[in-house]
């Protein structure tokens, strides 16, 4: 029972985590304009992995995709790659874990096979979570470096040479979503690995005796049901988990509601 709960919970936690990783990857707010100690502007800039956006105080929002591939910083490409690898591994892990769930019966799948699948999906979730955490952390490090560089530029005597106002960027909401989602996926993966240990059939010192009936064959094991992991009456009330996670991609059009003036 505890094994089933651990496996089921691991699956749900990972599902939420992967949904979060997908959401973070799609979000535009990876970096947002730093408003602290800056002149108050009527324009707010924010950037994602795929496009940069400008929201005017009028409510008008304009987003431009990064249509170049070669012109983008290597770090940004690396973050994109890490997030996509995390999503792909997580998606495969989810697919594998659905078949591995103890509360779902597929044909005459052996317990050992379910245990192996649970372990595989657990490892995939762990790697997926680590990829997301790494991706978000690399981006955050990039922001911190650029922040202090632009701060230094603001206070060095550039005079009238600079034609644009130095826009500093700080952590956006997507970073926190990514960190939490990566952590959840990692925790879910660990839970799946723990559940795998309980799923693996126990080795016994005695040989099973088979009694063959004429119509169909049933294998009986002496010593009660300690080693049993079959779908008997005790599985009637097991919850079958279905992933209802949705990601919302912000679609802003003009005119829109404005959240600041």
């Amino acid at each position: 029972m505890a094994v089933t709960a651990c496996q089921g919970l691991g699956f749900v936690v990972s599902l939420i985590g992967i949904a979060g990783i997908i959401a973070a990857t799609c979000m535009d707010q990876w970096s947002t304009q730093d408003l602290y100690n800056n002149p108050v502007t009527a324009v707010f800039n924010y950037q994602g992995l795929w496009r940069s956006c400008v929201r005017e105080s009028s409510g008008f929002t304009e987003c431009r995709g990064y249509f170049t591939l070669l012109g983008l910083p290597a770090m940004l490409q690396a973050v994109r790659a890490l997030m996509i690898v995390g999503i792909v591994l997580g998606a495969i892990g989810l697919l594998v874990s659905i078949f591995a769930l103890k509360c779902i019966r597929i044909g005459s799948m052996e317990d050992s096979a379910k245990a192996n699948m649970t372990l595989t999906s657990g490892i995939m979730f762990i790697v997926s979570g680590l990829c997301a955490i790494a991706g978000v952390s690399v981006f955050a490090n990039m922001l911190v470096t650029n922040f202090w560089m632009s701060t230094a530029n603001m206070y060095t005597g550039m005079g009238g040479m600079v034609q644009t106002v130095q826009t500093r960027y700080t952590f956006g909401a997507a970073l926190f979503v990514g960190w939490v989602a990566g952590g959840l996926t990692l925790i879910g993966g660990v839970m799946m690995c723990i559940a795998c240990r309980g799923l693996a059939p126990e080795e016994t010192n005695y040989k099973a005796v088979s009694y063959h009936a004429s119509g169909h064959s049933v294998a009986y094991k002496p010593g009660g049901f300690k080693a049993s992991t079959g779908f008997g009456s005790n599985t009637k009330n097991k919850k079958i988990y279905d992933g209802g996670a949705r990601t919302e991609d912000e679609v802003q059009s003009y005119p829109s509601k404005h959240d600041y003036v």
């Epitope: 304009q33 002149p39 108050v40 502007t41 009527a42 324009v43 800039n45 950037q47 940069s52 956006c53 400008v54 005017e56 105080s57 009028s58 409510g59 008008f60 304009e62 431009r64 600079v162 034609q163 644009t164 106002v165 826009t167 003009y254 005119p255 829109s256 509601k257 404005h258 959240d259 600041y260 003036v261």
Partner: antibody, heavy 118, light 113 residues
């Protein structure tokens, strides 16, 4: 078409307050900011502040901070500008305007002349 | 506050001739996020509210004749009336739409010579 209709001219005594209304029509009231701009006789334009009628958020020109209050009533779809502690130099035409893309003002009210005189 | 300086204060141009108004900002109005300059031009005729002509420094508002054009970037901007018409006699204002408080230039009065 978009229209912003303002209240009539006012004559006020120094130290008193004035409340000017602005009723837009022809668009969704809560979707655009309403800004207030004043123009003293024979002078240039001076931005006073803006309000988001949807959320009630306001931004003011520090020059008027504490003296000007911008409000919006969603039920009557009307924006208001109240200026207190009036002085003779507050004699001006007060305009309301709709803020659009580029943070520019595309539609303006006809203006309300406020005269401060003892 | 951002100071918007317009020049000249007044301008007399013959009908059909080119009129050029300059506007200088004390700080750059170019937003790095979208590479747009947050500067607007208005036309105001006596007894009327201002009328929007150009936003984002060079984007003409719908319904504005194409003889009006805006140019410039960063701190220096220009409004050009390619062929002055009688109905263009007015005061022209530039506005900073990037920094709060949103500030206007002192205005340039355009007259017919």
């Amino acid at each position: 078409q978009v229209q912003l209709v303002q209240s009539g001219a006012e004559v006020k005594k120094p130290g008193s307050s004035v409340k000017v209304s602005c009723k837009p029509s022809g668009y969704a009231f809560t979707n655009y900011l309403i800004d207030w701009v004043r123009q003293a006789p024979g002078q240039g334009l001076e931005w006073m502040g803006g309000i988001n009628p949807g959320s009630g958020d306001t931004v003011y020109n520090e020059k008027f901070q504490g003296r000007v209050t911008l409000t919006a009533d969603k039920s009557s779809m009307t924006a208001y500008m109240e200026l207190s502690s009036l002085r003779s130099e507050d004699t001006a035409v007060y305009f309301c305007a709709r803020r659009v893309r580029g943070n520019s003002f595309d539609s303006w009210g006809q203006g309300t002349l406020v005269t401060v005189s003892s | 506050d951002i100071v918007m300086t317009q020049s000249p204060d007044s301008l007399a141009v013959s009908l059909g001739e080119r009129a050029t108004i300059n506007c200088k900002s004390s700080q750059s109005l170019l937003n790095s996020g979208n590479q747009k300059n947050y500067l607007t031009w208005y036309q105001q005729k006596p007894g009327q509210p201002p009328k929007l002509l150009i936003y984002w420094a060079s984007t003409r508002e719908s319904g504005v004749p194409d003889r009006f054009s805006g140019s410039g970037s960063g701190k220096d901007f220009t409004l050009t009336i390619s062929s002055l018409q009688a109905e263009d006699v007015a005061v022209y204002y530039c506005q900073n739409n990037y920094f709060y408080p949103l500030t206007f230039g002192g205005g340039t009065k355009v007259e017919i010579k």
